[in-house]
Each structure stands twice: as C-alpha cells, then as structure tokens.
C-alpha cells in the first residue's frame, strides 16, 4: 500500500512538475527591466526564450518573435536546447510512469515489469528536473552577468560620442517556475525510484524435494519449486516436472492426493 | 550603432516656443522607441516625452502635457519636440535617446544624444 501511495505521490509530483516546466519554457518574462533607477519610464521590456515583448505604459503590449537562430546568444540557444530536453524527457518519463502504476492493470504485466518501467521513469524524471534546473540556472547566471556589465555601461558610456547604454535585466517571473518546477520533478523522480524498490520483492532461490506415499505416479525432481521475483522464467512457482523418467506402468497411473506438496 | 545629434536649443522668453530636433546616423530609428529627457542644473536626469517606432503611443510627463508634442519622421530618420509656452522650470539640457525595442535575446541598448541647452529667460 505504502508502495503505490509512494508511486502514486511521484508520479502526480511529476506530472505537476513537467506542467510547470512546459509553462515555464512558453513564458515571456524570463527577464524583465529593472525598474530601479532607471530613467525609461514610457515602455516596459521582458523576454522570453522564444520573443521580446514590449509593454507601454498606455498599456499597449507588443511582442516580436526571435526569427532568427544566428542572430542569438549561445548561452540563450543551449537553455533553450536544456529546456526542451527535459520537457521531451518529462514526457516520455510520465508516458512510461502511466503504464508501470501498480493500480493500473494492463493484460498480464508482472510486478518486474512494472519496477522496471517504474525505475525507468523515475531515472526520467530525474534527469528531467536537472534539465531544467540547469537551463534555468544558467539563464540566471547571464542575467547577473549582464546585470554588472550593464551597470558598468551606465557609467562609463556616458561620456563617448556614442552614449550606449544597456538596460539593466532582471529575474522574471518564469525564472522561479522553472526552478520550483524542476524542483518537483526531481523530488518526482526520487519517489518513483524509491517506489521501485518496493515493487520489486528480493529473488530468494531455494530447493523443495517433495516426498510422496503412493507408488510410482510422477517422479519428481528435486529444486521443483522456485520462489521468484518474475525476473526469471518460472514466474508461477509451477512444479517443474522431469518427463523423460517414466516407468512402462507410470503411463497408466493417475496422481494421488499425495503428489503435490 | 545610432548616432544620435541634437539641435534647435537656445535662448527663449517665458510663454515662447522652441522646436528641438534629433537627427540619428548609423541605422534607421524605424524599430527604435524615441524619448526625450532633461536635466536641469544641479538635478538629475527627468523623462520628458515618449513616442513608439511607428509614431504612436506617445507619453508625456506631467510637468509637460498639454505644452510639449513629440513627432517623428522615420523617412528622415528624424525625431521632433516642439515646445510651446516655455516656463523657467523648463530650463535644461534636452536629450533624445533611442530605445532598441525588439533586442534578440539580450538586453536592449538605449543610444543618447550629447544634449542640446534651452534656456527660459525673461
């Protein structure tokens, strides 16, 4: 019961977490204008991983897509490629996770199968989270990078004959989705391993002779029964019969009450 | 890079007018947004008017509305403010400033004149 709550729990984590990575990645305030002493009061600016937008203080809001892949920053190319990979991960991972929840039955799936595919997803999901996080992470990291470089321009570009100046970025709001999101899907991913150990009893092998009284009905051979974790063949903990040792009369005889242990 | 160059500055008497230009080289200002700014003496640097890349949407600051209009002419690369009943207050250096609006994945770039001084005096 513990098992499935834990399995159950991981997989809803996840799927929450995979929601917010996919909102996150579609957002457009990853960055945002630092209000702070900044003297562009007209027009507010903020950027996503795939358009600028631009809102006036009439309210009017314009956004523009980045039609182009030369044109862009590495850094921006490798969060968005991070990004992706996690919510393609995520994706798969929770298409995996579906099929291997203990309160679903599909045909014949055996316990193995489903600690396998529970493993599997939570391995997913887990690398998933770290995508993003990372992604994130570095987006963040060229903000602040930015942050000071612009904040140096402010000072030292005011007496050229070219007065640049770069408006100062800020965190935006996708920013703090894709980590909490990220988060959730990593802490997914964990309870999804740890589901799968209990999902997956330890294979103990041990040998059963069976004893019986009535004469010579079935011979049996010694190790007949096997307890397993459906990692192996015998899967049933059916008897395994030795059918080449029959005398003539054994081909007549019926089982007794007695032949099975 | 925008070049930009002010002019149209000078000595004005209170409730007169003044028409300040900023002319921008380098690259058209077509998908700039255009601001002009002051200062006055010993203060800092005050946001005076706005006007969008197309010529819209144009902002005012308080102190100036109903006084000051911004105009543009993107065929002339061209940015205008034209001042009218000029007060004391309005004594300052008036800069135009460029503001890179759709920045590819990176923060925009603002591009500043040198200034051009008015001054209000009876």
């Known amino acids: 019961m513990a098992v499935t709550a834990c399995q159950g729990l991981g997989f809803v984590v996840s799927l929450i977490g995979i929601a917010g990575i996919i909102a996150a990645t579609c957002m457009d305030q990853w960055s945002t204008q630092d209000l702070y002493n900044n003297p562009v009061t007209a027009v507010f600016n903020y950027q996503g991983l795939w358009r600028s937008c631009v809102r006036e203080s009439s309210g009017f809001t314009e956004c523009r897509g980045y039609f182009t892949l030369l044109g862009l920053p590495a850094m921006l190319q490798a969060v968005r490629a991070l990004m992706i990979v996690g919510i393609v991960l995520g994706a798969i991972g929770l298409l995996v996770s579906i099929f291997a929840l203990k309160c679903i039955r599909i045909g014949s799936m055996e316990d193995s199968a489903k600690a396998n595919m529970t493993l599997t997803s939570g391995i997913m999901f887990i690398v998933s989270g770290l995508c993003a996080i990372a992604g994130v992470s570095v987006f963040a990291n060229m903000l602040v990078t930015n942050f000071w470089m612009s904040t140096a321009n402010m000072y030292t570009g005011m007496g050229g004959m070219v007065q640049t100046v770069q408006t100062r970025y800020t965190f935006g709001a996708a920013l703090f989705v894709g980590w909490v999101a990220g988060g959730l899907t990593l802490i997914g991913g964990v309870m999804m391993c740890i589901a799968c150990r209990g999902l997956a009893p330890e294979e103990t092998n041990y040998k059963a002779v069976s004893y019986h009284a009535s004469g010579h009905s079935v011979a049996y051979k010694p190790g007949g029964f096997k307890a397993s974790t459906g990692f192996g063949s015998n899967t049933k903990n059916k008897k395994i019969y030795d059918g080449g040792a029959r005398t003539e009369d054994e081909v007549q005889s019926y089982p007794s009450k007695h032949d099975y242990v | 890079q925008v070049q930009l160059v002010e002019s149209g500055g000078g000595v004005v008497q209170p409730g007169g007018s003044l028409r300040l230009s900023c002319a921008a080289s380098?690259?058209?200002?077509?998908?700039?947004?255009t601001n002009w700014y002051r200062q006055a003496p010993g203060k800092g640097r005050e946001f005076v008017a706005f006007i969008n890349y197309r010529g819209g949407g144009a902002t005012y600051a308080d102190s100036v509305k109903d006084r000051f209009t911004i105009s543009r002419d993107n065929s002339k690369n061209t940015l205008y403010l034209q001042m009218n009943s000029l007060r004391a207050e309005d004594t300052a250096v008036y800069y135009c400033?460029?503001?890179?609006?759709?920045?590819?994945?990176?923060?925009?770039?603002?591009?500043w004149g040198q200034g051009t001084l008015v001054t209000v005096s009876s």
């Open positions: 380098g690259r058209a200002i077509g998908t700039y947004d």
């Open positions: 400033a460029a503001h890179e609006r759709f920045p590819m994945g990176r923060p925009p770039y603002d591009y």
